[in-house]
C-alpha cells in the first residue's frame, strides 16, 4: 500500500523559518503534489505550494522555495512574520496525486520536544485519505 511521509523542521538560524519535506512511498507516477497548512488540502487547509512534475511549481506566501528533491519527494521552505508566520504546532499536509489512479495524503507538525534544526529521519505517516 502506498504511503506518504511528512517531516517538519524548524531552522536553527531562523526560528520563523520551517522546512517541510514530503515523500511518496509507492509505485506509480505522481501527477501533482499539493502542500497545505492548517489541515488537509480541500478540507480547511490553506494551499502553500503545488508542484507538477512537468509544468512547474506554484507557491503562495509564506512559502519561499518549493522544489522537487526526487521524482517522489519534495521540500518546501517557509518563512514568515506576524500573521503569516507558522508556529510550532502548525499542521502541514502533503498530498500526492496520481491521476486517475488515486491520491494519498498525510500530515505532520514539528515534534513537540525537538530542538531547532534537529529532527528524526522521516518515517511514514498515517494515510489520511486514499481515493
Amino acid at each position: 500500500t502506498p504511503e506518504v511521509w511528512v517531516q517538519v523542521r524548524m531552522e536553527a538560524t531562523e526560528l520563523s523559518s520551517f522546512t517541510i519535506r514530503c515523500g511518496f512511498l509507492g509505485s506509480g507516477s505522481i501527477s501533482l503534489v499539493t502542500v497545505s497548512w492548517g489541515g488537509p488540502n480541500g478540507a480547511g487547509g490553506t494551499t502553500l505550494a503545488v508542484l507538477h512534475p512537468e509544468r512547474g511549481i506554484r507557491q503562495w506566501a509564506p512559502a519561499r522555495q518549493a522544489r522537487w528533491e526526487t521524482q517522489s519527494s519534495i521540500s518546501l521552505i517557509l518563512e514568515g512574520s506576524g500573521a503569516s508566520s507558522p508556529c510550532a504546532n502548525t499542521t502541514f499536509c502533503c498530498k500526492f496525486a496520481s491521476f486517475p489512479e488515486g491520491s494519498w495524503e498525510a500530515c505532520g507538525s514539528l515534534p513537540p520536544s525537538s530542538d531547532p534544526g534537529l529532527s528524526a529521519p522521516p518515517t511514514p505517516a498515517p494515510i489520511l485519505r486514499a481515493d
Epitope: 501533482l32 480541500g42 491521476f99
Partner: nanobody, 120 residues
C-alpha cells in the same frame, strides 16, 4: 472529504448528444479551475475542457464548437454538454478540480468517471 460525482454517461449514436453532470461537495476553498478530462480505451488522458476561476471556458481543439462546459455555483455543479458526438469521443470522462499551470488545469481531485460510448 472532497467528493466529485459524475453522471450522464451512456451509449449514444454518432451525431447524438449527451450532457454530463458533476456534483461537487466537501470543498472549503477555491481552486483555480474545474473541468473534464477523458481517457479513451487504450489511450492516454486528455484535458477536454475547463473553466478558470475567472469564468472563462477553455476547450481542446478537437471538441471546439461541439462541447460546452458550464457551472452552476448555486448547485456546486459542473456540466459538459456534448453535441455532434463522434466515435473518437468514446472514453471515460472525469470531472476534476485543480490548479492552473498556463492553460493546463492540473487535477488535484477527481470523480470516479462516467463512460461515454459513441457507436451505431
Amino acid at each position: 472529504e472532497v467528493q466529485l460525482v459524475e453522471s450522464g454517461g451512456g451509449l449514444v449514436q454518432p451525431g447524438g448528444s449527451l450532457r454530463l453532470s458533476c456534483a461537487a461537495s466537501g470543498y472549503t476553498f477555491s481552486t483555480d479551475c474545474m473541468g473534464w478530462f477523458r481517457q479513451a480505451p487504450g489511450k492516454g488522458l486528455e484535458g477536454v475542457a475547463h473553466i478558470d476561476s475567472d469564468g472563462i471556458p477553455r476547450y481542446v481543439e478537437s471538441v471546439k464548437g461541439r462541447f460546452t462546459i458550464s457551472q452552476d455555483h448555486a448547485k456546486n455543479s459542473l456540466y459538459l454538454q456534448m453535441n455532434s458526438l463522434r466515435a473518437e469521443d468514446t472514453a471515460v470522462y472525469y470531472c476534476v478540480v485543480g490548479f492552473k499551470f498556463g492553460d493546463y488545469c492540473a487535477p488535484n481531485d477527481w470523480g470516479q468517471g462516467t463512460m461515454v460510448t459513441v457507436s451505431s
